[in-house]
């Protein structure tokens, strides 16, 4: 008689990424009997919560429940009802909430408290909401991409399962760019990590990893823009800021109170003779790049070498996956191809930034103006951060892979976070079982 497959024995997990600009819910699925195998967990759903990041719910936390409803209901639909009670739910908040906590622990705690009460109302196994550290964010992003790339598997394969695979076990570095922070994480080559804060030791699948990581708070793309505006308005002669990071013909009024609201601009704060100023775009990549470089203090380094602001950075080693906003921005600019050199990227950015705003709006009619207006800045910022901040060169640029998804799962910290909290990455290599007896009858 023909073998008949049993009902699939699967498990699910939910992670909410509460970022500075928005919240996303991810649903993961894996075969129950292969929990400790590498590469078996995959993403089955992403739901982007409508609205801003949770840190913006200060003064209206009573609206958080409604805000989360659609995506939590989507999770209810996707995950079979019989699995609801055993499906863990985790919420991790990142730099937007780190900044809020710096301003007021009470307000940050209140937001998280209401998030927890809202998520506890669902039939899942809610495991808590917390602000993860920048170090965790970097580490879990690194775990995610290497897990998905199969780098933790001890089996050598004669075939490649993912586009970036080089069939060796050397891990990829992780470059993550958010709205409020950016993370760099990699295994340096035989290099002592000179600052203990930046050192992580892992034992995964029987192998030891000494990992370097740093999270630069305030250097996500949105906070970097606020920093740049706060820096530049200091030297403006009046309430007009001619800004090379915006397209020619672009105009926008900014409230000074909005500019100084974030802790990221405190170092540039001064009493201005006006309450509003107008950004007038002039669209010049080179000048924009120069202005951005002023955000990176490279004059001081207490180590053998630094990234910027006196933060230790070992020599770059190996390939890097650049994800989150690194990917979204470069994808929009059509610059994610492996074949595009750094020089070509710079040329394309020069042309893009110089395009008149009216022309840009016509060419990208479907894109919200708020986002559209910032791609020139964001693209220039990415180049500045990678080249001058992290010391990539024209030659090492080819080692950066702009990655959105790997094997259908988003690159980001959420998968690594769940794998860790559900103990699905063993320290030792599990005994291999070629085929589980429960698979067929």
């Amino acid at each position: 008689t023909q073998n008949k497959a049993l009902p699939e024995n699967v498990k699910y997990g939910i992670v909410l990424d509460a970022g500075s600009s928005h919240t996303s819910l991810y649903i993961y699925k894996w075969p129950a009997e292969k929990e400790n195998d590498t590469g078996v967990v995959h993403q089955v759903e992403e739901c982007r919560v409508k609205g801003p990041g949770i840190s913006k719910f200060v003064q209206k936390v009573n609206e958080i429940g409604i805000y989360l409803t659609d995506c939590m209901e989507r999770a209810r639909e996707v995950i079979p009802r019989s699995q609801h009670q055993e499906t863990p739910v985790y919420l991790g908040a990142t730099a937007g909430m780190r900044l809020l906590r710096m301003e007021s622990e009470e307000l940050a705690d209140r937001v998280l408290d209401v998030v927890e009460r809202s998520l506890s109302n669902y039939p899942f196994d809610f495991q808590g909401a917390r602000i993860i550290t920048g170090q965790e964010e970097g580490a879990y992003g690194w775990i995610t991409i290497n897990y998905l790339l199969g780098k933790f598997s001890q089996k050598t394969r004669w075939f490649s399962i993912v586009p970036y695979e080089t069939n060796n076990q050397e891990t990829f570095g992780a470059l993550d760019l958010g709205g409020a922070s950016t993370q760099v994480t990699f295994v340096p080559q035989n290099q002592t990590i000179e600052s203990p804060d930046n050192a992580l030791q892992f034992r995964l699948y029987g192998k030891d990893y000494n990992v370097y990581t740093h999270s630069f708070l305030c250097y996500g793309k949105d906070q970097a823009l606020w920093q740049k505006l706060a820096k530049d308005i200091q030297v403006a002669s009046n309430e007009i800021l001619r800004d090379p990071c915006f397209h020619p013909g672009y105009k926008k009024v900014v409230n000074v109170s909005d500019l100084y609201k974030t802790p990221c601009t405190k170092r540039f704060e001064m009493t201005l003779p006006f309450q509003q100023f107008e950004i007038q775009g002039i669209g010049n990549y080179q000048q924009c790049h120069q202005s951005i470089l002023e955000l990176f203090n490279t004059s001081y380094c207490p180590y053998s070498q630094c990234a910027f602001n006196g933060i230790f950075l070992p020599p770059l080693q190996g390939d890097f996956g650049a994800f989150s906003a690194f990917y979204f921005v470069m994808k929009f600019l059509n610059l994610t191809s492996e074949k595009v050199s750094q020089e070509k990227v710079t040329e394309m950015m020069k042309k893009f930034c110089a395009q008149p705003w009216e022309e840009i709006k016509t060419s990208y009619a479907g894109v919200k103006e708020k986002y559209l207006s910032e791609y020139c800045f964001s693209g220039t910022y990415i180049l500045s951060l990678l080249l001058q901040g992290y010391h990539f060169t024209a030659d090492s640029w080819e080692h950066i892979h702009f990655i959105g998804k790997i094997q259908g799962s988003d690159a980001g910290w959420t998968l690594g976070y769940m794998l860790n909290l559900t103990n699905m990455i063993p320290a030792e290599q599990p005994l291999s079982t070629p085929l589980s007896h429960s698979t067929y009858v």
Partner: antibody, heavy 121, light 107 residues
Framework: QVQLVQSGSELKKPGASVKISCKAS????????MNWVRQAPGQGLEWMGW????????TYADDFKGRFVFSLDTSVSTAYLQISSLKAEDTAVYYC??????????????WGQGTLVTVSS | DIQMTQSPSSLSASVGDRVTITCKAS??????VAWFQQKPGKAPKSLIY???YRYSGVPSRFSGSGSGTDFTLTISSLQPEDFATYYC?????????FGQGTKLEIK
């Protein structure tokens, strides 16, 4: 202690504009929203809306959309209410009231002393 | 909009009396109801929030109760300083609304 001090009475002609202020002290201004409430002579209280002092977001009751504008100057912990194209029926006392979080929702806990705006030709 | 209907609209009572003012909401507002006291020429003063919780400094003779659509404010033993107008207020749904007021006068 928490205090909301409003600007003094105003006498205006129809069609003119008025801007009244509400200066907060005794707490961190950007940690609490600010409501505005109107009370016409001999009448009850009407909620006009509120301003989020952290994000600048504005929420208006339908009857107060258009000629009524809430604004802020966080550097001096002050909220403002501006009314343009004044009409006789805008004659009222206008109150600011702090929006504070108590038991899972937001209430008006402290009130300014009120500003009387009289519109008369 | 949610209507808040207070009754009575005015009430005469004596010092030492127990007084109850009621407020009926046109829709369920949970316990998101507050009560305010206002004296002539003065700003309202916050007494009760979340239907039954007194603000600090508010005398214990003031108490609130109710949930859903029916709410009451009770003053257990009237004092001379309690003669004023009292307003109920719902903050469950935008636009927030107030009752029309109950004027409490000395008999």
């Amino acid at each position: 202690q928490v205090q909301l001090v409003q600007s003094g009475s105003e006498l205006k002609k129809p069609g003119a504009s008025v801007k009244i202020s509400c200066k907060a002290s005794g707490y961190t201004f950007t940690h609490y929203g600010m409501n505005w409430v109107r009370q016409a002579p001999g009448q009850g209280l009407e909620w006009m809306g509120w301003i989020n002092t952290y994000t600048g977001e504005l929420t208006y009751a339908d009857d107060f959309k258009g000629r009524f504008v809430f604004s802020l100057d966080t550097s001096v912990s002050t909220a403002y209410l501006q009314i343009s194209s004044l009409k006789a029926e805008d004659t009222a006392v206008y109150y600011c009231a702090r929006r504070a979080y108590y038991r899972y929702d937001y209430v008006m806990d402290y009130w300014g002393q009120g500003t009387l705006v009289t519109v008369s030709s | 909009d949610i209507q808040m209907t207070q009754s009575p609209s005015s009430l005469s009572a004596s010092v030492g009396d127990r007084v109850t003012i009621t407020c009926k909401a046109s829709h369920n507002v949970g316990t998101n109801v507050a009560w305010f006291q206002q004296k002539p020429g003065k700003a309202p003063k916050s007494l009760i929030y979340s239907a039954s919780y007194r603000y600090s400094g508010v005398p214990s003779r003031f108490s609130g109760s109710g949930s859903g659509t029916d709410f009451t404010l009770t003053i257990s033993s009237l004092q001379p300083e309690d003669f004023a107008t009292y307003y109920c207020h719902q903050y469950n749904n935008y636009p927030y609304t107030f009752g029309q007021g109950t004027k409490l006068e000395i008999k």
